[in-house]
């Protein structure tokens, strides 16, 4: 995929944005108690653009497209307490904890990757 | 898919813009002369988002892209002149004529419907 | 008691997919209370985590292999089933299905495990 | 190379106790439960601990789990010919997003 697109000399004035924002995350399970963490989520503005296709093609589509995800996490365990359950009193979710976000090309998997 | 999304309770001074920017387009065919056409390319910055994601997952996975394509779009035909082939002299390509764009969802194939 | 067994092609070449299902008996794959897990050995050597999933269909990848796994559940036949792609010798190794007690790192019952050699 | 690090072998007496250790970091054991596994010759593992100290109903309580910082700790008392295996501990690590396992530890009782 083609790197990313900062800025557009036919728009110069204006610059993709892609924000790693603090959220409250709610994290619950059937028959548990939902536990509230800090967590982050990704938000913004990229950059894409569709130039007019031929057929047959001259040359490679030219579609563009970037979108805000997220560009470093880690998956932690956290644990719910399940006092109505004698079988399973606890229960292990796993939560994906946003480090930092960026504008990446549209189709690709968001990047999971450890510190 | 869910509806595009053109403004943000968190950046109410940010909007969502996707622009049809007039263009000059070469057509072009191995052998026989370009012509230049007038048309339409689609640019812009729609908004996305990814919010955290959990397994077992409580709900869908919430992540949101729009990306800047046409929302409009007939495909005409250019002749093009192939003075050097005796056989086939002249070629017929199909070009894509973009009349309006819009903030679409990112999976989506752009709308090539006539007007 | 649960039991799981491991069912599938002893011997998958080069380049092609791997595919092996867990059967499970004596308990329900739908009753919300477990996450089902494939882990591998190595010959000779430690253990590794490939993933798990839930009834629902949720599904989560050991990152490091995510890129050629898939796990998938048919709660019609109390089966889940692994798909590992473009395997190489060093995907031979003792494939085990397991169940843990919706606790992620705890694996209370094992499938006796299977040999899956990677060899053209 | 394994994340966590255990001894490859130890070796005791019968009646004498053994003690396994398994060393991490903070993104793994530093802030995540422990199970232990004993994998005898020829069969799958099989849950010895759990939550660093937990054992499952029909594990005797000559088997002993503990964590202190990065580190947990498998003991086994009044060894028997049968516990001759491999050991394993487990835990999540959340740098790398995914479950891991030591190296294992044989044990001999001698």
């Known amino acids: 995929a083609p790197p990313p697109i900062n800025k557009l000399a036919l728009f110069p004035d204006k610059s993709a944005w892609c924000e790693a924002k603090n959220i409250t995350q709610i994290v619950g399970h059937s028959g548990c108690e939902a536990k509230s963490i800090q967590n982050r989520a990704c938000l913004g503005q990229c950059f894409s653009y569709s130039v007019p296709n031929t057929f047959p093609q001259s040359t490679e589509s030219l579609v563009h497209c970037d979108s805000c995800m997220p560009a470093q996490s880690m998956w932690e365990i956290v644990t719910l307490e399940c006092p109505g359950h004698e079988e399973v009193p606890r229960v292990d979710k796993l939560v994906e904890k946003i480090v930092h976000c960026s504008c990446q090309a549209c189709g690709k998997e968001p990047s999971h990757e450890g510190l | 898919a869910p509806p595009p999304i053109n403004k943000l309770a968190l950046f109410p001074d940010k909007s969502a813009w996707c622009e049809a920017k007039n263009i000059t387009q070469i057509v072009g065919h191995s052998g026989c002369e370009a012509k230049s056409i007038q048309n339409r390319a689609c640019l812009g910055q729609c908004f996305s988002y990814s919010v955290p994601n959990t397994f077992p997952q409580s709900t869908e996975s919430l992540v949101h892209c729009d990306s800047c394509m046409p929302a409009q779009s007939m495909w005409e035909i250019v002749t093009l002149e192939c003075p050097g082939h005796e056989e086939v002299p002249r070629v017929d390509k199909l070009v894509e004529k973009i009349v309006h764009c819009s903030c679409q969802a990112c999976g989506k194939e752009p709308s090539h419907e006539g007007l | 008691e649960v039991q799981l067994l491991e069912s599938g092609p002893g011997l998958v070449k080069p380049s092609q997919t791997l595919s092996l299902t867990c059967t499970v008996s004596?308990?329900?794959?739908?009753?919300?209370?477990?996450?089902w897990s494939w882990i591998r050995q190595h010959p000779g050597k430690g253990l590794e985590w490939i993933g798990y999933i839930y009834y629902s269909g949720s599904t989560y990848y050991n990152p490091s292999l995510k890129s050629r796994v898939t796990i998938s559940v048919d709660t019609s036949k109390n089966q889940f089933s692994l798909k590992l792609s473009s395997v190489t010798a060093a995907d031979t190794a003792v494939y085990y299905c397991?169940?843990?007690?919706?606790?992620?790192?705890?694996?209370?019952?094992w499938g006796q495990g299977t040999l899956v050699t990677v060899s053209s | 190379q394994s994340v966590l690090t255990q001894p490859p072998s130890v070796s005791a007496a019968p009646g004498q106790k053994v003690t396994i250790s398994c060393s991490g970091s903070?993104?793994?054991?530093?802030?995540?439960?422990v199970s232990w596994y004993q994998q005898l010759p020829g069969t799958a593992p099989k849950l010895l601990i759990y939550?660093?100290?937990k054992r499952p109903s029909g594990i005797p309580d000559r088997f002993s789990g503990s964590k202190s910082g990065t580190s947990a700790t498998l003991g086994i008392t009044g060894l028997q010919t049968g516990d001759e295996a491999d050991y394993y501990c487990?835990?999540?690590?959340?740098?790398?997003?995914?479950?891991?396992f030591g190296g294992g530890t044989q044990l001999t009782v001698l």
């Open positions: 903070s993104s793994n054991i530093g802030n995540n439960y």
């Open positions: 397991a169940r843990t007690n919706s606790r992620i790192t705890m694996i209370a019952d």
């Open positions: 004596g308990g329900s794959i739908s009753s919300g209370g477990y996450y």
């Open positions: 487990g835990t999540w690590d959340s740098s790398l997003s995914a479950g891991v």
């Open positions: 939550d660093n100290n």
